[in-house]
Amino acid sequence: EDELQVIQPEKSVSVAAGESATLRCAMTSLIPVGPIMWFRGAGAGRELIYNQKEGHFPRVTTVSELTKRNNLDFSISISNITPADAGTYYCVKFRKGSPDDVEFKSGAGTELSVRAKPS
């Protein structure tokens, strides 16, 4: 039995330059206890996009909409999208550890592609 599922329902999202991109992520449980972070890319070189607990992410807002009892919404919106934002975004659950939190489970990823700004 899975302890928790990380659900990124959209494999890909296409957004026009200058618009906002909504990246969806839902989880089935808060347990194990620990933070949720968003990254672009995978592996050692991945880029932190959003961490609720610390850091400054002026282009990112949270967009929780799900009110179902067994779906916790950890979706984000990134404003003013540029071609440099293209890539695959991962919603990642961490488990509280000592001294450092441990990566527990990642969503399957959502590929963001950026269309040219309509003229």
Epitope: E3, L4, T28, S29, I31, P32
Partner: antibody
Framework: EVQLVESGGGLVKPGGSLRLSCAAS????????MSWVRQTPGKGLEWVAT????????YYPDSVKGRFTLSRDNAKNSLYLQMNSLRAEDTAVYYC???????????WGQGTTVTVSS | DIVITQSPASLAVSLGERATISCRAS??????????MHWYQQKPGQPPKLLIY???NLESGVPDRFSGSGSRTDFTLTINPLQAEDVATYYC??????????FGGGTKVEIK
């Protein structure tokens, strides 16, 4: 119909042990986070322990950490709380509670009373 | 620990009127726009019953005269209109990432 039935409470001397059980029915037990919450007239409601749906992760407040151990048997739809080194301040009604998402407690049992006294 | 201050400790309201209960947390219980504050009703001799989850979501089967609002540190449970069967003690509970999870001290609601 969801049912949570606690058992195992009773009178025990300080320093003694008790094992509480909670039998669950009416829902998919193995998908739910399970907890114990206790209630005393003086202190109100106090969270005691939580275990993840698969049983891998357990959490306790400092007041019981190292003395209480929470476990579950998903094949038997059962939850267990082993309470050791009991103190007078552990006297309370102990409720078993389920949570589909690990946040709010959806359903509660009727409770079992634990009295720690010499 | 996150301390929850619940007020008032007791409340007497006329039938058909509005009852309002407040809970204030010592720090934010929000994450990703969700508020991990919940409300329960407990009648004498019974276990608590979930009314509202995540600040404002009505639990299935709960009458819509119960409503919840608030975010971050300040939360409110409203019963409007109050009915005789609502006489009970009400508790708030936070389940944020910051353990331990904690409860408010309770509010006893009576009929005036």
């Amino acid at each position: 119909e969801v049912q949570l039935v606690e058992s195992g409470g009773g009178l025990v001397k300080p320093g003694g042990s008790l094992r509480l059980s909670c039998a669950a029915s009416g829902f998919t037990f193995s998908s739910y986070v399970m907890s114990w919450v206790r209630q005393t007239p003086g202190k109100g409601l106090e969270w005691v322990a939580t275990i993840s749906s698969g049983g891998t992760y357990t959490y306790y407040p400092d007041s019981v950490k190292g003395r209480f151990t929470l476990s579950r048997d998903n094949a038997k739809n059962s939850l267990y709380l082993q309470m050791n080194s009991l103190r007078a301040e552990d006297t309370a009604v102990y409720y078993c509670a389920s949570s589909v998402d690990g946040s709010a407690f959806d359903y509660w049992g009727q409770g079992t009373t634990v009295t720690v006294s010499s | 620990d996150i301390v929850i201050t619940q007020s008032p400790a007791s409340l007497a309201v006329s039938l058909g009127e509005r009852a309002t209960i407040s809970c204030r947390a010592s720090e934010s219980v929000d994450s990703y726009g969700m508020s991990f504050m919940h409300w329960y009703q407990q009648k004498p001799g019974q276990p608590p019953k979930l009314l509202i989850y995540r600040a404002s979501n009505l639990e299935s089967g709960v009458p819509d005269r119960f409503s919840g609002s608030g975010s971050r540190t300040d939360f409110t449970l409203t019963i409007n209109p109050l009915q005789a069967e609502d006489v009970a003690t009400y508790y708030c509970h936070q389940s944020s990432e910051n353990l331990p999870w904690t409860f408010g001290g309770g509010t006893k609601v009576e009929i005036k």
